[in-house]
């Protein structure tokens, strides 16, 4: 359960892959598409508002036997839209929603070496946001393997301004 309905902190950041491709968001036909692309030098990186929540995670919920206090995150690139896991389609989508946010919008934050992060689905332990064919997708990671596979590693570049949406 998430320990409280308000985030403990928020930050504004641009999101890129381990290989320094940018995660961008484009409004197309009244819905948002998510792209993974090389940015032209002069193009500004898209910003994402990360809201961090604490969660007590009993081991029975988790496929990897992890229990204890977890740090969970929601990602919002534009007002009222949040990244969500679609476990049926193994996809990552942007949906307009109201608070309280659905569980599909929450991801367990994993810090990784080289100051990278990974995002694990709250609703499907062992499944992470990853890069597949220049799109974001949900990728199942075998816990017996190292979680260092590059396609689930992301870099957060913080943008230090007041943490409000900026549209």
């Amino acid at each position: 359960s998430i320990t409280g309905i308000s985030p403990i902190t928020e930050s504004l950041a641009s999101l890129s892959t381990y290989n320094d491709q940018s995660i961008t968001f484009a409004l197309e036909d009244e819905s948002y598409e998510i792209y993974v692309e090389d940015l032209k030098k002069d193009k500004k990186k898209d910003k994402v508002l990360l809201s961090y929540y604490e969660s007590q995670h009993p081991s029975s919920e988790s496929g990897d036997g992890v229990d204890g206090k977890m740090l969970m995150v929601t990602l919002s690139p534009t007002k009222d839209f949040w990244l969500q896991a679609n476990n049926k389609e193994h996809s990552v989508e942007l949906h307009k929603c109201e608070k309280p946010l659905p569980d599909q919008a929450f991801f367990v934050l994993h810090n990784r070496s080289f100051n990278c992060v990974s995002f694990e689905c709250k609703t499907d332990p062992g499944v992470f946001i990853g890069v597949k064919d220049n799109h974001l997708a949900l990728i199942k990671v075998d816990y017996s393997e190292n979680l260092g596979s590059e396609n689930i590693l992301f870099k957060l570049s913080e943008i230090l301004e007041h943490h409000h949406h900026h549209h």
Epitope: I8, T9, E10, S11, L12, Y52, E54, H57, S59, D64, G65, V66, D67, G68, K69, M70, L71, V108, L109, H110, N111, S113, N115, E120, Y143, N146, L147, G148, E158, L160, H163
Partner: antibody, heavy 122, light 107 residues
Framework: QVQLVQSGAEVKKPGASVKVSCKAS????????ISWVRQAPGQGLEWMGW????????HYVQKFQGRVSMTTDTSTSTAYMELRSLRSDDTAVYYC???????????????WGQGTLVTVSS | DIQMTQSPSSVSASVGDRVTITCRAS??????LAWYQQKPGKAPQLLIY???SLQSGVPSRFSGSGSGSDFTLTISSLQPEDFATYYC?????????FGGGTKVEIK
């Protein structure tokens, strides 16, 4: 309740190695990362590195690279820090500390061992 | 590496005083900063994390604030048991780094 109990004080000669243990109890050991922090006499705190108790991944501060090894034994819920080629300026109290989030180092260290004094003297 | 600079290095205060300790980072980050209290011969104890979140069991006279490069620990009304050394620590990126410490002494 959560406890981290470290091994006793050590006196070592320059060039020797020391291995400090940190036995955890009161929580699921492989859920949380462990960091090692040292404090020279009368000085501040210095972070040495981190190990994931979950998968054994580790990250060491550059100045200790090649001289330090951090390991865990999940069967005994114990973390170890070995420092090799000891010098007199390695004389310090060495602490193990638990990260406060299971999968993240963002939250700082919520539980600490009592410290192990390592004296390096010829 | 992010360098953390604490000021003052020591402060003399009386019971009941309001004490403020600052921590400046060599490069800015949003909020992953922790504060610890350490008494002689003891291990540090976590007081504040995420810049302003009070660790469970810590008295409410301790508070933290700030983001970017400047962070503050405030003790609203100093108690006898608060005389100790205080350290900030950035938990934003590896290598994790500590400030040099601030010793709060009895005036």
């Amino acid at each position: 309740q959560v406890q981290l109990v470290q091994s006793g004080a050590e006196v070592k000669k320059p060039g020797a190695s020391v291995k400090v243990s940190c036995k955890a109890s009161g929580y699921t050991f492989n859920s949380y990362g462990i960091s090692w922090v040292r404090q020279a006499p009368g000085q501040g705190l210095e972070w040495m590195g981190w190990i994931s108790s979950h998968n054994g991944n580790s990250h060491y501060v550059q100045k200790f690279q090649g001289r330090v090894s951090m390991t865990t034994d999940t069967s005994t819920s114990t973390a170890y820090m070995e420092l090799r080629s000891l010098r007199s300026d390695d004389t310090a109290v060495y602490y193990c500390a638990r990260h406060s989030y299971t999968t993240s180092w963002y939250g700082g260290f919520d539980y600490w061992g009592q410290g192990t004094l390592v004296t390096v003297s010829s | 590496d992010i360098q953390m600079t604490q000021s003052p290095s020591s402060v003399s205060a009386s019971v009941g005083d309001r004490v403020t300790i600052t921590c400046r980072a060599s490069q800015g980050f949003s909020s992953w900063l922790a504060w610890y209290q350490q008494k002689p011969g003891k291990a540090p104890q976590l007081l504040i994390y995420a810049a302003s979140s009070l660790q469970s069991g810590v008295p409410s006279r301790f508070s933290g604030s700030g983001s970017g490069s400047d962070f503050t620990l405030t003790i609203s009304s100093l108690q006898p048991e608060d005389f100790a050394t205080y350290y900030c620590q950035q938990a934003n990126s590896f290598p994790l780094t500590f400030g040099g410490g601030t010793k709060v002494e009895i005036k």
